[in-house]
């Protein structure tokens, strides 16, 4: 009382930091700093982040919250998790689509667009790896189909059908005639 020296930050508990004259307790995640504390080891005045904004960490200095990102509809992105006061929107791809990074060194914050997954069934192939972080990995031709060029061709259903060597190996009994 009545002194003139500002105290050092030797407050009980953690998360106190000098803000101007005094050591203040910071604001919890999801809150911004309205006004710093007005006495040693005091609580700052903190307010909840308004709608469509967030702060993910405890902080001493943010006087405004960060704006939530909007998922890029042009890139076919969707919100996997909506923005909250403590976390930004998590954008991703809807089921049946995969993330295609727009930069070579891809990290979680890199820009991306969504691509439709390959439908192995439509290509008459086995699904070797399901599509999630990368495109579907299709395997060999389904039963009743054989490799021909880049695709799978249906085994001939009549004796009139031509059946090259690979067809004969896969289609079996069909190549008796």
């Amino acid at each position: 009382q009545g002194g003139t020296r500002s105290p050092r930050c030797d407050c009980a508990g953690d998360f106190h930091k000098k803000i101007g004259l005094f050591c203040c307790r910071g604001c919890p995640a999801g809150h911004y700093l309205k006004a710093p504390c007005t006495e040693p080891c005091g609580n700052s005045t903190c307010l909840v982040c308004p709608q469509d904004t967030f702060l993910a960490w405890e902080n001493h200095h943010n006087s405004e919250c960060a704006r939530c990102q909007a998922c890029d509809e042009q890139a076919s992105q969707v919100a996997l998790e909506n923005c909250s006061a403590v976390a930004d929107t998590r954008c991703g791809c809807k089921p049946g689509w995969f993330v295609e990074c727009q930069v070579s060194q891809c990290v979680s914050s890199s820009p991306f667009y969504c691509q439709p997954c390959l439908d192995c069934g439509a290509l008459h192939r086995h699904t070797r790896l399901l599509c999630s972080r990368r495109d579907t990995d299709c395997g060999t031709c389904l039963p009743g189909f054989y490799e021909h060029g880049d695709g799978c061709v249906s085994c001939p259903t009549s004796t009139l059908g031509s059946c090259p060597e690979r067809c004969a190996a896969v289609c079996g009994w069909r190549q008796m005639f």
């Epitope: 003139t4 500002s6 101007g20 004259l21 309205k34 710093p36 504390c37 007005t38 006495e39 005045t45």
Partner: antibody, heavy 116, light 107 residues
Framework: EVQLVESGGGSVQPGGSLRLSCAAS????????MSWVRQAPGKGLEWISY????????YYADSVKGQFTISRDNAKNSLYLQMNSLRAEDTAVYYC?????????WGQGTLVTVSS | DIVMTQSPSSLSASVGDRVTITCQAS??????LSWYQQKPGKAPKLLIN???NLETGVPSRFSGSGSGTDFTFTISSLQPEDIATYYC?????????FGQGTRLEIK
């Protein structure tokens, strides 16, 4: 709109007393630390006292310690400065100012003249 | 107490000039420094806090820089309405102290 309005200034003889008031409006007064700053005629600014938002902590410049008392009434949104044993060198315009260090709003000031 | 030394104490400049005022603290005050403008007969007005943060509504021609003990206040292009006295102020420690002021006038 934030407003700070000082009152209570005037002329007083050396050794006399005055009580300055500062009426605050347009913000949550009880959330802010407040200070008194004075300015002698033709001179610079001198911080003289600070009070925390709750009124629990007060600080004074050495030049007024034991002579001036800062106080506040959050229910009335008011800040006060009780000035005793006034001397000629206390003649100044007295400003109330909002903030815990950096003063973002100031009143228009009230003139205190100490003269026989 | 922390002594704030402002220079120059007065200066004369022309409209459009770049004006620089310096402020030196007698000890390290980090970035806990404000700049104020005071026009005759008026209360001071906060222009910059935390050494370089421009207050809302303050024209962008005003700027501040520095940390530790040496600080600079700049008006990039002097306007007639900038005629005033400018003060630096530290709030790293009590007692809060001001520089002695810099009186700015038009040539």
């Amino acid at each position: 709109e934030v407003q700070l309005v000082e009152s209570g200034g005037g002329s007083v003889q050396p050794g006399g007393s005055l009580r300055l008031s500062c009426a605050a409006s347009g913000f949550t007064f009880s959330s802010y630390g407040m200070s008194w700053v004075r300015q002698a005629p033709g001179k610079g600014l001198e911080w003289i006292s600070y009070i925390s938002s709750s009124g629990g902590h007060t600080y004074y410049a050495d030049s007024v310690k034991g002579q001036f008392t800062i106080s506040r009434d959050n229910a009335k949104n008011s800040l006060y400065l009780q000035m005793n044993s006034l001397r000629a060198e206390d003649t100044a315009v007295y400003y109330c100012a909002r903030g815990s260090g950096s003063f973002d709003y100031w009143g228009q000031g009230t003139l205190v003249t100490v003269s026989s | 107490d922390i002594v704030m030394t402002q220079s120059p104490s007065s200066l004369s400049a022309s409209v459009g000039d770049r004006v620089t005022i310096t402020c030196q603290a007698s000890q390290d005050i980090s970035n806990y420094l404000s700049w104020y403008q005071q026009k005759p007969g008026k209360a001071p007005k906060l222009l910059i806090n935390d050494a370089s943060n421009l207050e809302t509504g303050v024209p962008s021609r005003f700027s501040g820089s520095g940390s530790g003990t040496d600080f600079t206040f700049t008006i990039s292009s002097l306007q007639p309405e900038d005629i005033a006295t400018y003060y630096c102020q530290q709030y790293d420690n009590l007692p809060i102290t001001f520089g002695q002021g810099t009186r700015l006038e038009i040539k």
